[in-house]
Amino acid sequence: EEELQVIQPDKSISVAAGESATLHCTVTSLIPVGPIQWFRGAGPGRELIYNQKEGHFPRVTTVSDLTKRNNMDFSIRISNITPADAGTYYCVKFRKGSPDDVEFKSGAGTELSVRAKPSAPVVSGPAARATPQHTVSFTCESHGFSPRDITLKWFKNGNELSDFQTNVDPAGDSVSYSIHSTAKVVLTREDVHSQVICEVAHVTLQGDPLRGTANLSETIRVPPTLEVTQQPVRAENQVNVTCQVRKFYPQRLQLTWLENGNVSRTETASTLTENKDGTYNWMSWLLVNVSAHRDDVKLTCQVEHDGQPAVSKSHDLKVSAHPKEQGSNTAPGPALASAAPL
């Protein structure tokens, strides 16, 4: 009778993580008597996957009924494959012996590669906010995929970005891989509603890439523009001075009025108007009783936005422009009165 051969017909197979892998093996003879064993890897460090003779292998089932003597099919099925199962599997025929069974013949091996989906990309931006015209960096990370080939793209509002660097680790063979990419984005005043998207395409995703997003509203700070104006006289001896705070983001804003350098009133922005671009406007005003002043008054609107150093705008209120007698009928009281829109 011809000497037994161990046939592993598949040089390689590829299986998606979570699925089962079937490793095929047939022998050409019933002799010599002895068990079949499956190993991952070769040499002294090889890992026993299945032993026909003994042991508990909860993830392994035999494809054929090994209790039938004329069975020559020793294929196995490994359930719930993970990237850690990747490797070359050998079907090995042993001859019964002591003190150990003797390896008689090995199959050529079947390389199992595991297709594992990348994790959802996580995009993170800078720790601190930045203002328009500045360049900020965004990072994108995805892990646990296999094989190593992967494509990563960056978009800002649907437009593909080109200024980015990507690394896939590790460089050598591994059960699974990670990707890390850093993109540079120039901020504009219109970016409050903008999104940066990291898109990852991999063979396991069947043409439906994974996306991670970052809203630039978390990253951008648009400083306000200030305008202080004197409104027409509202009542005899009273002047309405307004401070328009325009186009700022985020909302956090505190406004202080100063009269000739002295703090008159501090208020926190509350009822804001939102612009189409996502920035906000706010207005504060003062009612100034000019009859209480002999000299010109310098009114300053000072704004502290999002914890940044204050910016201010001043307005000179000319007292001399009013008739001297206008203060004669005014009851004594505060020199400044204020109001803000509800």
């Epitope: 009778e1 019933l30 002799i31 008597v33 002895g34 068990p35 079949i36 026909q52 003779k53 003994e54 090994l66 209790t67 039938k68 003597r69 004329n70 069975n71 019964k96 012996g97 002591s98 003190p99 150990d100 069974d101």
Partner: antibody
Amino acid sequence: EVQLVESGGGLVQPGGSLRLSCAASGFTLSSYDMHWVRQATGKGLEWVSAIGTAGDTYYTGSVKGRFTISRENAKNSLYLQMNSLRAGDTAVYYCVRGGVWDDAFDIWGQGTMVTVSS
Amino acid sequence: DIQMTQSPSSLSASVGDRVTITCRASQDINNYLAWFQQKPGKAPKSLIYTASSLHSGVPSKFSGSGSGTDFTLTISSLQPEDFATYYCQQYVSYPYTFGQGTKLEIK
């Protein structure tokens, strides 16, 4: 049902011959290593002979040259030709099937009695 | 030839008892050891192969262990039908050899 049925035992004079048969049913005999085991009255079990799937044969020392194991695939039967019989060969002879991959005995026949006496 | 030695040769026990029979090989036999049960006038019945694997239909009260040269058969809770003679056998190499048997009797 997997079954082994022995026949051919009986009384024979020392120096005489006897041919034991074992008819297998429920499985293909040629796919298994097959054995003969004997047991003298009140004694333990003694392995006698085996035939492998490739036709290779094995014997215990005391029967070598006197006993011959064979099989007939068409009849799905195993045989033991016993020549030059001695009083020490008196025993119940069992036909036994070897296990699937390690030749562990799994199926036994009911036995046939061989008595060697003058 | 490989010699197989069983102990004890006979053993008295009661229903419900747990009993252990040992078998020693004269040389390493890996785990190619089988256990058989035989009742008077009957053919032996296969219980265990490769030292610890139960043949189909054998109740789990029977268990085997060991490797190399020392092996044991344990019956966890004796029932009346378990009183019989038990044999061990090595089948790693020809000639296959049996132990002399252990007769388990009712006390």
